[in-house]
Each structure stands twice: as C-alpha cells, then as structure tokens.
Interface confidence: low
C-alpha cells in the first residue's frame, strides 16, 4: 500500500509520461520564519506547477537527515531527532522544544518522477520569548495563503452544500466525491490516531522484504533517500533508480 499516496495526491500530482520535457515545478516554502525558544514550528513546502509524481520527501538540516516521507515505506525520523521531530502535518515536519541551536537552514527535497529533484529552503530563527512575538513579520505568506485557500474552499463547499440541500433535500452524496475529498489530504496525520490509508505513517521497523519476497532482488531498491532521476513501477513494487 502506498502510505503517502494521499499526501502525494494532495499535491495535485499525477504520473507523468516517461519522456518529460523541462522541469517546470516550483517549490513554495514558509521562507524565513522565526519561533520562540521552547516552542514548536511547522516546516512546510509545497510543490506546484508540475505533473510529476512525488516519490519521496526528505527533510534535511545542512547535510544532516531529519526525516524521510517515502511513498511506499512511510515516515522515517532520524534517531538523533526522534525526541523533537514529529511527522506532519501532511508532508511537512514539526520541530518541537526549539533551542537557539536549531537556528539555521532547513531543506525539503522532493524526489519526483520524471522531473528529478526539487529543493526548497527554509531559514528558521529561534528567538528568546520576548523577541519572537515580533518575528511574525518574517513569515512568507505561504501559510497564510494556504489558510486563506482553505477558508475559501470551505466557504465554497458550505455554499455549494447549502444550495444543493435546498434544491435536493433527499440527494444522495457521491461516494466518489467524499473519497476524493479525503484523498486530497484534508485530514492531518495525527501520531495518536491511526493513519488514513495513503498517508505517511511512522515506519519504525519497516520490514526488509516489504514489497514481497517472491520478487527477489528486483524489489531490493525499495529504499532510500536517493535523489531520483528515474523511477519505475512494477505492480506494487517501487523502484528508486538513483541518483544524486
């Protein structure tokens, strides 16, 4: 099962043909952000303007791995950061118990097929409590834009639902529509609740033969934080054919 499929769908991505042209995608990030010492912060990136399929998202700080969200294997949080890093919401990452040492550059690295690798940069400044209150001015409007978009969508949905109910009180809602809404990643992943199918889940002990032992070594590439230049799929088995 593709645990991250829901989140990939939420990016509005679909499988693109093998013969791809120029890389057209862009990564929007939360940009320069500031947060209070001891507090939490959500790192978010959003890949847009491409039909490429996201196969994996890495979160890195300098050359240090924080976490991986793999479309097949789910979440892997680096042991060094397990106590202070939580997966989600979505393909994002939550940093907790911030210290001044957490100040610095963070990178979201989207591995896609057939485009290749997209990298987004976020600069986090961890401030003393009194200073952090003024730090909001550094926020790039992405989160605000996302929130605004959600508000608009919710409003539109409410209006449409209201009108629909008015016109057809006994109308049966489309199952496809409900599923589509769910699979568009409207629900946040919660560590305390079971993951919805298709979301990135914590893969603490991902079995080595996850893709089926009968496929033998052809399945052996179901891993890792490669920079993907090419990717192929065979049944339920995903192949990361490097690189980077």
């Amino acid at each position: 099962m593709r645990w991250c499929l829901l989140l990939i769908w939420a990016q509005g991505l679909r499988q693109a043909p093998l013969a791809s042209g120029m890389m057209t995608g862009t990564i929007e990030t939360t940009g320069n952000i500031s947060a209070e010492k001891g507090g939490s912060i959500i790192l978010q990136c959003h890949l847009s303007s491409t039909t490429a399929q996201v196969t994996q998202v890495n979160w890195e700080q300098q050359d240090q791995l924080l976490a991986i969200c793999n479309a097949d294997l789910g979440w892997h949080i680096s042991p060094s950061f397990k106590d202070r890093v939580a997966p989600g919401p979505g393909l994002g990452l939550t940093l907790q118990s911030l210290t001044v040492n957490d100040t610095g550059e963070y990178f979201c690295i989207y591995h896609t097929y057939p485009d290749g690798t997209y990298t987004g940069r976020i600069f986090l400044e961890v401030l003393e409590s009194s200073v952090a209150e003024h730090g909001a001015r550094f926020q790039i409007p992405l989160l605000g834009a996302m929130a605004a978009t959600l508000v608009v969508i919710c409003t539109a949905v409410i209006v449409v639902v209201a009108l629909t109910r008015k016109k057809k009180a006994l109308r049966i809602h489309s199952v496809e529509g409900d599923l589509r809404r769910k699979s568009a990643g409207q629900e946040e992943w919660s560590p305390s609740a079971p993951s919805p199918p298709g979301s990135c889940v914590q893969a603490e002990a991902a079995p080595a033969g996850l893709c089926g032992e009968q496929r033998g070594e052809d399945c052996a590439e179901l891993h890792d934080y490669f920079n993907v230049l090419s990717y192929r799929s065979l049944g339920n088995c995903s192949f990361f054919t490097e690189t980077g």
């Epitope: 890195e60 990298t119 991902a206």
Partner: antibody, heavy 119, light 111 residues
Framework: EIQLQQTGPELVKPGASVNISCKAS????????MIWVKQSHGKSLEWIGN????????HYNLKFKGKATLTVDKSSTTAYMQLNSLTSEDSAVYYC????????????WGQGTTLTVSS | DIVLTQSPASLAVSLGQRATISCRAS??????????MHWYQQKPGQPPKLLIY???NLESGVPARFSGSGSGTDFTLNIHPVEEEDAATYYC?????????FGGGTKLEIK
C-alpha cells in the same frame, strides 16, 4: 570520530566464497546508506552496490548482481558483503564507504580489504 | 551507463602552480540546479578521500586550495597552489544515474 573498520586481507581458493565486514562507529548507522566499491590492482574504482541499514534493502550494479550479496546487522552496526564463486578476476581491494545524505558522494571510507583468489 | 573520461591521465605540476583536471561525462549529470559530480583523492595504500561533492562543494577539512566547477557534462578540479602532499591519483565520480561510475583517474606528480 566516524570510522569504518574492515576485516583484514583474505586469501581464498577459486570457487569459494568470502564474507567481508565493515564495522561502523561514530554516527547513526541507520541514517546513512553503506556502499561497496571494488578496486582492481592499478585500476579505477567500481561501485558494487549499496544497502540501506534502516530499511534493509539493497541495490546492485548489474555487473555484480549474483556475485555480491549485501547485508547489515543493525545491532552491531556492521555491514557485510559476501562474494561467491570466486575467480582470479575477483582479486582486488574492496572498500565500504558511507554515502552522503544530499547526494551519492562517499564521505567516509573503510581502509579496504585485500582479497586474493588463488589456488 | 554514464562513462566518465578524465584528462589528462597524468600530469606533472611545479610546486605552487595550478593543477587542472578535467572530467567529461557521456551524459548530463545535472538536474534541478544541482550537478551530481564528486571528486576524490587517493594515495597509494589508502582509501579514496572525498574532496568535492556536487561539483563545487568543498568537503569539511579539505584545504581551500581545492576547488571544483562545471555543470552538465564538463567538470573541472583545480588545485592551486599545488603542495607536495597533493601528489596522488584523483578520481571523478557521478551519481546522476545508476550505476554510479568513476573516471579512470588522473595521476598528479609534483615537480
């Protein structure tokens, strides 16, 4: 200090198998892919394959598929490479190395294990 | 497979001068603004040592006299000023596609 400690030189007979180990220390073993490289005498380097210690999955250079088998033991932070059906062509120095995170560059290397296949 | 051709196969450079080593790939190893070409130094009896990763990033602990440049298919390693301890064989390696391959090596001799 980050270290990759490999087993000493091996002298084996043609047709036999050998298991080379690479003990990692000084870093989080499961965070970094381990790669293996062959260097024949006086020649360049060849990538054999790599294994992800966390997920346990490996990938091979097609040239070495069937010749090399890569495994890891997370509890002892050790990577292993088994070479089978050995011939004189397999005589070489074999290195394990740690793959960087942001790209497949190899930032720390073992000292190398010299394998001699001779009757 | 991507073939990496290094040139020259060997060169002799006077102490304090510049050494330039070229590596040409049979296919582009660059994407999304990154070039997946790396450089190593190897001395006899020792394992290779990473000098430069992703074309131009200096590995920590490596002297600043080493620098890398290039994108697409053409890459260069520069050493300036050359020092006695730089006598070694230098290899380029790509990770632009599987299998990862190395160049044939360039042997640097100090005059």
């Amino acid at each position: 200090e980050i270290q990759l400690q490999q087993t000493g030189p091996e002298l084996v007979k043609p047709g036999a198998s050998v298991n080379i180990s690479c003990k990692a220390s000084g870093y989080s073993f499961t965070d970094y892919i381990m790669i293996w490289v062959k260097q024949s005498h006086g020649k360049s380097l060849e990538w054999i394959g790599n294994i992800h210690p966390y997920f346990g999955n490996s990938h091979y250079n097609l040239k070495f598929k069937g010749k090399a088998t890569l495994t890891v033991d997370k509890s002892s932070t050790t990577a292993y490479m088994q070479l089978n059906s050995l011939t004189s062509e397999d005589s070489a120095v074999y290195y394990c190395a740690r793959r960087g995170i942001t790209s497949a560059h190899f930032d720390y290397w073992g000292q190398g294990t010299t394998l001699t296949v001779s009757s | 497979d991507i073939v990496l051709t290094q040139s020259p196969a060997s060169l002799a450079v006077s102490l304090g001068q510049r050494a330039t080593i070229s590596c040409r790939a049979s296919k582009s190893v660059s994407t999304s603004g990154y070039s997946y070409m790396h450089w190593y130094q190897q001395k006899p009896g020792q394992p290779p040592k990473l000098l430069i990763y992703r074309a131009s990033n200096l590995e920590s602990g490596v002297p600043a006299r080493f620098s890398g440049s290039g994108s697409g298919t053409d890459f260069t390693l520069n050493i300036h000023p050359v020092e006695e301890e730089d006598a070694a064989t230098y290899y380029c390696q790509h990770s632009g596609d599987l299998p990862w391959t190395f160049g044939g090596g360039t042997k640097l001799e100090i005059k």
